[in-house]
């Protein structure tokens, strides 16, 4: 076809200077020489479709997909990626070729896929297809451990499907409550996968590799403890193993334990019992309920009964998919400059979430604390009284959750001024957002009390760095005030601050700051 333009497709690799994620049509990075991607006409396709050679990119690498079109006249274009249209701005190089670029900064899995470029020239329409994939990378992971029964033995095996293969340890504690904290002397750690001593008060298995440490607690009902005010609840996903331990201590061996699901005895093979005498000659019995791979019909109330203790129950809920339940409505807070304050998010989630707090594009570690009612809470106190937008982000295998917070710090306005030949502007970031007054200083008004109302324009703008509001006021210069000193004042409920500006002809402008409480 004579009308077909000459097309060249190239890949430009950029050496990252720690650029942020995004797409644009300019690239302020060091670039390597372009690599020709061929761009051959695709046979047997409806319409004119050019296909570039497949592009494999390292994770976090930055690239530009570029098309050079040798066709007369103007061109217009449109990029399409995953059914979304992306902005396209063609320009012309020194050889008068049309140049269309797509910049991918810090490549991630979400940016991999097919990029379609639709080009319309005066002569014809055509499509160019780029396929971008991430280079085969192994993903090191750390997953929460789970339990399995050891074949033909009354023992638990702790498994964490992680790479590098983690160091597995059992964390055992025989005290109650606070004394079972990680570094307490009551805590014993055993660096092994199999645990035979299953009578302890608190049993956890932890797995650690260079990505961190993840722990799973053996869910326990203790018949000698007062039941919780709210029924304990255990969530599991279909296919996961279920383990519940029922524990009871009695003065002698004359008692037995049984498990029921919704008033029906558990089938044999779904429980096993162990017993031992404690140091004071009392008998400890434990009865495990376990299902190696749960299904929806394993949902329900699991009740442990004893002939010598009141029975206790736990609600086991089997879900198809993980979830994060929390209110995602944004919250605004207004605090004083030295007031102690923490953001907090209360949520219920399964599997356990990973979370981050973000402020001004910087991420902070996120700690979670379990509450008695099955909810968890994450608090963030490290805001250092910086106003702006704070983001809580949580995700697990199946769900994502984001919540926005705005922090406003009550403070007296601080005024900054700038001037040009035609106007003077004042800016302030005090909170609550200040109101403005402009005053003219003259022989008649040496204390600058003569108010200016003409030519004043006030606005508030979002300062992008912190998501914090800045108020500004601009005075358009008129002959009546040229050569005079003017004063702009910002005031709110906490005080007033002013700047004095000399409105002379263009040149350096002296500013006199004037703080009034």
């Amino acid at each position: 076809n004579q009308d077909l333009p000459v097309i060249k497709c190239v890949l430009i690799n950029h050496k990252n200077n720690d650029s942020s994620v995004g797409k644009s049509s300019s690239y302020p990075m060091v670039s390597e020489s372009p690599e020709d991607l061929g761009c051959a006409l695709r046979p047997q396709s409806s319409g004119t479709v050019y296909e570039a050679a497949a592009v494999e990119v390292d994770v976090s690498a930055s690239i530009t997909l570029q098309v050079l079109v040798d066709a007369p006249g103007n061109i217009s274009c449109l990029w399409v990626f995953k059914h979304s249209s992306l902005n396209c701005q063609p320009h012309f190089d020194l050889q008068n070729r049309g140049v269309v670029s797509m910049v991918i900064l810090k490549m991630t899995e979400t940016q991999a896929g097919e990029y379609l470029l639709f080009i319309q020239s005066e002569a014809t329409n055509y499509t160019i297809l780029f396929t971008v994939s991430i280079r085969n990378t192994l993903l090191y992971t750390l997953r929460r451990p789970y339990f399995r029964k050891m074949e033909n033995q009354d023992a638990l095996v702790c498994i964490s499907e992680s790479v590098p293969e983690p160091i597995v340890e059992w964390v055992l504690c025989d005290s109650q409550g606070e004394s079972c904290k990680e570094e307490s002397p009551a805590v014993v750690k055993k660096e092994e996968k199999v645990l035979h001593e299953l009578f302890g008060t608190d049993i956890r298995c932890c797995a650690r590799n260079e990505l961190g440490r993840e722990c799973t607690r053996l869910f326990t009902i203790d018949l000698n403890q007062t039941p919780q005010t709210t029924l304990p609840q255990l969530f599991l996903k279909v296919g996961e193993p279920l383990w519940i331990r029922c524990k009871a201590v009695h003065v002698n061996h004359g008692f037995g334990l049984t498990w029921e699901l919704e008033n029906k005895a558990l089938e044999e093979g779904n429980y096993f019992e162990m017993s031992t005498y404690s140091t004071n000659r009392t008998m400890i019995r434990i009865l495990f309920a376990f299902v190696s791979s749960v299904a929806r019909n394993d949902t329900g109330y699991y009740t442990c009964s004893s002939s010598k203790h009141p029975s206790q129950s736990a609600l086991v809920t089997i879900v198809e998919k993980g979830f994060i339940n929390a209110t995602n409505s944004s919250e605004d807070y207004e605090i004083d400059q030295y007031e102690e304050f923490c953001f907090s998010v209360r949520f219920k989630a399964y599997p356990q979430i990973r979370c981050t707090w973000t402020f001004s594009r910087k991420s902070f570690p996120c700690e979670q604390k379990g509450l008695d009612n099955g909810y968890s809470i994450s608090k963030f106190c490290n805001h250092k009284h910086q106003p702006g937008e704070y983001i809580f982000h949580a995700e697990n295998d199946d769900a994502q959750f984001t919540k926005m917070f705005t922090l406003n710090i009550r403070r007296k306005p601080q005024v900054l001024a700038e001037a040009s030949a035609s106007q003077a502007s004042c800016f302030s970031d005090g909170y609550p957002l200040p109101s403005w007054t402009w005053k003219k200083c003259s022989d008649k008004s040496p204390n600058c009390t003569e108010e200016i109302t003409e030519g004043v324009w006030n606005r508030k703008a979002n300062r992008k760095v912190f998501g914090q509001w800045v108020s500004s006021s601009t005075l358009n210069m008129s002959e009546a005030i040229k050569g005079f000193l003017v004063k702009c004042c910002a005031y709110n409920s906490l005080g007033t601050s002013c700047e004095t500006i000399l409105l002379n002809s263009p040149g350096p402008f002296p500013f006199i700051q004037d703080n009034i409480s």
Partner: antibody, heavy 129, light 107 residues
Framework: QVQLVESGGGVVQPGRSLRLSCAAS????????MHWVRQAPGKGLEWVAV????????FYAESVKGRFTISRDNSKNTLYLQMNSLRAEDTAVYYC??????????????????????WGQGTTVTVSS | DIQMTQSPSSLSASVGDRVTITCRAS??????LNWYQQKPGKAPKLLIY???SLQSGVPSRFSGSGSGTEFTLTISSLQPEDFATYYC?????????FGGGTKVEIK
């Protein structure tokens, strides 16, 4: 460009201590796990230790466990190896190497891993009386 | 600990030869294996990661294969600059372990 530069090597008597440093540049240091690897004269490579991206998890070869400590200062883009109770068999060229890059995939924290893809030039430690 | 046994420990070959080096793990390491090249007085250089993926900037005459316990590094046509020592590394579990090395010398 991406670079690792080791320093702190030297001659030291058995039983004494030495601290090696590795200055990183050209990449986001705080997003990567970091390793120390050593090579005794005329011998093969031996992995020594690794530290996680934020510095809270360390793992060691059995031969150095309890004597060596790996640490990092992300604000200074620097990796360290504190070597105590040094022995003659610790004599080697010590290399620092970049490990995996942190990511989060469906709530599971992970490292993209190309292997130890960037190495320093090495610093020599000689333990001799 | 996982032992990595590399063979041969040394070999002599000529420019243009096809060279094969093997690495055997004492237990399965999936594809968590890398191959490195080291020249005298220099730091090791990553050639292959994930058992078979070619590191960026490495010539295509180098290739890796295998998974589980048996792995191979192949140089399809040996070039003068390829005379060096080659090491495999498993990073499936701690401690990470290197093979003993294979020295490729000029015949």
């Amino acid at each position: 460009q991406v670079q690792l530069v080791e320093s702190g090597g030297g001659v030291v008597q058995p039983g004494r201590s030495l601290r090696l440093s590795c200055a990183a540049s050209g990449f986001t240091f705080s997003s990567y796990g970091m390793h120390w690897v050593r090579q005794a004269p005329g011998k093969g490579l031996e992995w020594v230790a690794v530290i996680s991206y934020e510095g809270s998890n360390e793992f060691y070869a059995e031969s150095v466990k309890g004597r060596f400590t790996i640490s990092r200062d992300n604000s200074k883009n620097t990796l360290y190896l504190q070597m105590n109770s040094l022995r003659a068999e610790d004599t080697a060229v010590y290399y620092c190497a970049r490990g995996g890059e942190i990511t989060m995939v469906r709530g599971v924290i992970g490292y993209y891993y190309y292997g130890m893809d960037v190495w320093g030039q090495g610093t020599t430690v000689t333990v001799s009386s | 600990d996982i032992q990595m046994t590399q063979s041969p420990s040394s070999l002599s070959a000529s420019v243009g030869d096809r060279v094969t080096i093997t690495c055997r793990a004492s237990q399965s390491i999936s594809s968590y294996l890398n191959w490195y090249q080291q020249k005298p007085g220099k730091a090791p250089k990553l050639l292959i990661y994930a058992a078979s993926s070619l590191q960026s900037g490495v010539p295509s005459r180098f290739s890796g294969s295998g998974s589980g316990t048996e792995f191979t590094l192949t140089i399809s046509s040996l070039q003068p600059e390829d005379f060096a020592t080659y090491y495999c590394l498993q990073h499936n579990s701690y401690p990470l372990t290197f093979g003993g090395g294979t020295k490729v010398e000029i015949k």
